[in-house]
Interface confidence: low
């Protein structure tokens, strides 16, 4: 893993004045033990609105690696395997919580951060805008 | 909001032996200020694999409210507006991090938890699984 130098300005984790601060145990409890590990591994390829997955890495964030979906086409794949531009591939986005090291490089202090990620793509009927 | 009684067994947030613990500032920084608030508000209805959104609430979790997508149909909507069962609506799932109060009802101590949520649905070509 990456060794992050300790910032001398990191707050003392026992500082009672640390704003709206809570203690968080990083031993992650995974509630997904019974889920099929292949649950959606190939949907990105089999979808009528297929997508590619791009790795987004940031050592100052926890989790440091997030996978971002990018739709492959503007249109959707039809029954013949061709791109149909009468439909649109659009990203399904979700706001997720991550932990951001704050101040930077501090090993034991974080701020909650909300980021928007594209999880996959779906095929939608386009909205027709009528020009006045 | 719900007032959660303090559990007398809550760990002291200054306890140096608290396992793999970090300080987290809950003043959320939102990186999504420039995003279009309507970004996917109607995709659930316009998709060829439409979905409904179900509210999942848990006061012991942060965030306490998570919206779960449930695909409306087994098949996908075709050009005529009918359900085509030769294609499948499937949920796009993502593992997200949440904070779980631990021990329960403690206002200032949490454990990171990974949960699987369905964000929306996409239309895929069916796959044949051979049974051993």
């Amino acid at each position: 893993g990456i060794t992050i130098p300790r910032n001398p300005g990191c707050p003392n984790s026992e500082d009672k004045n640390f704003p709206r601060t809570v203690m968080v145990n990083l031993n992650i409890h995974n509630r997904n033990t019974n889920t099929n590990p292949k649950r959606s591994s190939d949907y990105y390829n089999r979808s009528t609105s297929p997508w590619n997955l791009h790795r987004n890495e940031d050592p100052e964030r926890y989790p440091s690696v997030i996978w971002e979906a990018k739709c492959r086409h503007l249109g959707c794949i039809n029954a013949d395997g061709n791109v149909d531009y009468h439909m649109n591939s659009v990203p399904i986005q979700q706001e997720i919580l991550v932990l951001r090291r704050e101040p930077p490089h501090c090993p034991n202090s974080f701020r909650l951060e909300k980021i928007l990620v594209s999880v996959g793509c779906t095929c939608v009927t386009p909205i027709v805008h009528h020009v006045a | 909001g719900i007032t959660i009684p303090r559990n007398p067994g809550c760990p002291n947030s200054e306890d140096k032996n608290f396992p793999r613990t970090v300080m987290v500032n809950l003043n959320i920084h939102n990186r999504n200020t420039n995003t279009n608030p309507k970004r996917s508000s109607d995709y659930y209805n316009r998709s060829t694999s439409p979905w409904n959104l179900h509210r999942n609430e848990d006061p012991e979790r942060y965030p306490s409210v998570i919206w779960e997508a449930k695909c409306r149909h087994l098949g996908c909507i075709n050009a005529d507006g009918n359900v085509d069962y030769h294609m499948n609506s499937v949920p796009i799932q993502q593992e997200i991090l949440v904070l779980r109060r631990e021990p329960p009802h403690c206002p200032n101590s949490f454990r990171l938890e990974k949960i699987l949520v369905s964000v929306g649905c996409t239309c895929v070509t069916p796959i044949v699984h051979h049974v051993a």
Partner: antibody, heavy 124, light 107 residues
Framework: EVQLVESGGGLVQPGGSLRLSCAAS????????MAWVRQAPGKGLEWVAT???????YYRDSVKGRFTISRDNAKNSLYLQMNSLRAEDTAVYYC??????????????????WGQGTLVTVSS | AIQLTQSPSSLSASVGDRVTITCRAD??????MHWYQQKPGKAPKLLIY???NSEIGVPDRFSGSGSGTDFRLTISSLQPEDFATYYC?????????FGQGTKVEIK
């Protein structure tokens, strides 16, 4: 265990009507598509109609406009309303449901469970 | 409608014989082909789904193969309880269609 029990068959004159029922149990009825399949005496199997979980309906051409497939999810029941009956509609009518397993993303639409059948005779 | 043609319409075989029944579609049904067994006075029983998958509880002497338009049901070693009529079914497109059936009789 999946159970399908048909009822409502009988003797009817040409041009008459009958309503077949199928009581389903042992599976989450509202989640599955259901079908009616018939078999004329001494003949092969013939698909009649399917209703999807969301109520969408599909019919063979020879019964379109005469037969109506419907469902009551609260009662776990499937129905086939048959109007303007003809001699060629004489058959044993089976109610059928798809498999209950789910492997990946397979459109589960082939009949896996069948009722015992109910005989419809159209004759003057 | 997609037409399915089974061959032969009937066959006579002995216990222990290997039997193959074919089902030909007049257009592609991809992998949406299934096989049923029916005995007189009884409801059909699903044997094979999606070309080659054995339904739970079906003896492994029954197997399916093929793709697109040509499909086969094979009984590797015919048993006394296998004498029945066999049907193929396509669920690729409405209206769903069955083959006309193949009657397997004792020689």
């Amino acid at each position: 265990e999946v159970q399908l029990v048909e009822s409502g068959g009988g003797l009817v004159q040409p041009g008459g009507s009958l309503r077949l029922s199928c009581a389903a149990s042992g599976f989450p009825f509202s989640d599955y598509s259901m079908a009616w399949v018939r078999q004329a005496p001494g003949k092969g199997l013939e698909w009649v109609a399917t209703i999807g979980p969301s109520g969408d309906t599909y019919y063979r051409d020879s019964v379109k406009g005469r037969f109506t497939i419907s469902r009551d999810n609260a009662k776990n029941s499937l129905y086939l309303q048959m109007n303007s009956l003809r001699a060629e509609d004489t058959a044993v009518y089976y109610c059928a449901s798809p498999p209950q397993y789910y492997e990946g993303s397979i459109p589960r639409l082939w009949p896996a469970h069948w009722g015992q059948g109910t005989l419809v005779t159209v004759s003057s | 409608a997609i037409q399915l043609t089974q061959s032969p319409s009937s066959l006579s075989a002995s216990v222990g014989d290997r039997v193959t029944i074919t089902c030909r579609a007049d257009e592609s049904v991809r992998t949406l082909m299934h096989w049923y067994q029916q005995k007189p006075g009884k409801a059909p029983k699903l044997l094979i789904y999606l070309v080659s998958n054995s339904e739970i509880g079906v003896p492994d002497r029954f197997s399916g193969s093929g793709s697109g338009t040509d499909f086969r049901l094979t009984i590797s070693s015919l048993q006394p309880e296998d004498f029945a009529t066999y049907y193929c079914l396509q669920t690729h497109s409405y209206p769903y269609t069955f083959g006309q059936g193949t009657k397997v009789e004792i020689k």
